[in-house]
Interface confidence: low
């Protein structure tokens, strides 16, 4: 999501941000959920060979080999079973890294909403970050950029999108007359509201930050149960629980 109308953040002040790369190029964003798990948008991985994918943590300037950076391959991808590429419905996936991140000042976790949390209501102040272009003309950012946005009423957003939204989408607006938000190169990055990942960058309009087509996110709170179910089922356990079986290939 190219961040429009934003600002460069203090380096490593968003330690949960992940850069998903293919062919050595930044492709999408994501956030670190657990030391071995990254949440991103499902559409980022359509027709992509996971073997060529890398996840970079602890980055600020992507073009620099910063000492804080940790680079991982992608062990497994779990896309939401109801993801629909045409409508962007249920646009969420989980990446299991091929190693565990070492948590520290530059690499940290971001929590999703609680299982019973309600999504942010219209007017809530949030922020969205990414390494995408900073203009409509493929201008690269100096480092990780962030924009402050506000949650938009779903009726208003749905009207702007001609009725095409689904119930598990979340929208934002700039909050003032300036163009502010994301576009297309950092899908999967988190919308952070009240220090929780309430949204995942999903899609937007032709022009960055255009209020006529507000930014649309996957509403994370609708998928919290699914997220933790995937993590629980796929993570190695200390020992089998009574009445359960370990997933194939998982060592005790």
């Amino acid at each position: 999501a190219q961040i429009i109308g934003g600002h460069e953040v203090t380096p490593h002040s968003r330690p949960y941000m992940a850069s998903v790369r293919f062919g050595g190029q930044h492709h999408c964003g994501g956030f670190l959920l657990r030391a071995r798990w990254v949440v991103s948008a499902a559409h980022c991985f359509s027709h992509r060979d996971l073997r060529t994918g890398l996840v970079v943590l602890g980055a600020h300037v992507l073009s620099t080999a910063e000492p804080t950076q940790q680079v991982f391959g992608i062990d497994a991808l779990t896309t939401h079973p109801d993801y629909h590429p045409m409508t962007h419905a249920n646009d969420i996936c989980l990446l299991r890294l091929n190693g565990s991140a070492v948590l520290g000042p530059a690499v940290g976790l971001l929590r999703p909403p609680g299982r019973r949390a309600r999504p942010p209501t219209a007017g809530t102040r949030c922020r969205v970050a990414g390494w995408g272009f900073v203009s409509d003309f493929e201008e690269l950012p100096p480092g990780l950029m962030e924009a402050k946005v506000r949650v938009l009423d779903p009726d208003v957003c749905n009207s702007s999108w001609k009725g095409h939204l689904t119930l598990t989408m979340l929208c934002t607006r700039s909050g003032d007359s300036h163009r502010r938000g994301f576009c297309s190169a950092d899908s999967g990055g988190p919308l952070v509201c009240r220090n929780r990942a309430h949204g995942l960058v999903s899609f937007s309009g032709l022009w960055c930050g255009d209020p006529k087509t507000p930014d649309v996110y996957t509403q994370v709170s609708a998928f919290v149960a699914w997220i933790w179910d995937v993590v629980r089922r796929s993570s190695p356990q200390p020992g089998p629980l009574p009445g359960t079986t370990r997933p194939p290939g998982e060592a005790a």
């Epitope: 609680g114 299982r115 019973r116 949390a117 309600r118 999504p119 942010p120 209501t121 219209a122 949650v151 009423d153 779903p154 009726d155 208003v156 749905n158 009207s159 702007s160 009725g163 119930l167 598990t168 979340l170 509403q219 709170s221 609708a222």
Partner: antibody, heavy 122, light 107 residues
């Protein structure tokens, strides 16, 4: 098929209490907030309040604040409207309705129950 | 609270007539307006949401328009089953508020 079924209405004296139930089926109860809307005889619609069943958050109209309490039992897919200190002007048909948008606190109501009549009279 | 004022409060029309009901909000509500139809003894039914979007299963003779403070519900060719009371509702801010209703009667 989405269904909302209210029950618990009846005749009650001024100052009395009544609890209405709204049994929901055909959708994921915790994904949508539930509103209560009332309609006095021959009058228009008035929103009473709403609950988000997934965390129990509630919101009330000023006219009922402090007297009415909305709750939900997610294990039973049921929302409740507890009405205390009832007045004659609370006489109405009470409807529960599903709020269509997952993240709208209250908003467009796409499915409604059949309503239950509450009469407050001595 | 935002006030929603409907006009007219009632109207008489014949089958086949074009009927227009208006709703005015006391402040800007963008396009966050819904329209409902209610028949005697029945619950309201959603017709239009987001000012102009036809709800699933609603006949195409119903249409909505407007943004800001002024909104319109139009029935292009009134059918016998359309005689009912119609309500507008803003969902822009809490609490949601309804118009007082417009009763469409047979002429």
């Amino acid at each position: 098929e989405v269904q909302l079924v209210e029950s618990g209405g009846g005749l009650v004296q001024p100052g009395g209490s009544l609890r209405l139930s709204c049994a929901a089926s055909g959708f994921t109860f915790t994904n949508n907030s539930i509103s209560w809307v009332r309609q006095a005889p021959g009058k228009g619609l008035e929103w009473v309040g709403a609950i988000s069943p997934n965390n129990g958050s509630t919101y009330y109209a000023d006219s009922v604040k402090g007297r009415f309490t909305i709750s939900a039992d997610t294990s039973k897919n049921t929302a409740y409207l507890q009405m205390n200190s009832l007045r004659a002007e609370d006489t109405a048909v009470y409807y529960c309705a599903r709020n269509a948008w997952h993240y709208s606190w209250v908003g467009v109501m796409d499915y409604w129950g059949q309503g239950t009549l509450v009469t407050v009279s001595s | 609270d935002i006030q929603m004022t409907q006009s007219p409060s009632s109207l008489s029309a014949s089958v086949g007539d074009r009927v227009t009901i208006t709703c005015r909000a006391s402040q800007d509500v963008s396009t966050a307006v819904a329209w409902y139809q209610q028949k005697p003894g029945k619950a309201p039914k959603l017709l239009i949401y987001s000012a102009s979007f036809l709800y699933s299963g609603v006949p195409s003779r119903f249409s909505g328009s407007g943004s800001g403070t002024d909104f319109t519900l139009t029935i292009s060719s009134l059918q016998p089953e359309d005689f009912a009371t119609y309500y507008c509702q803003q969902s822009y801010t809490t609490p949601p508020t309804f118009g007082q209703g417009t009763k469409v009667e047979i002429k």
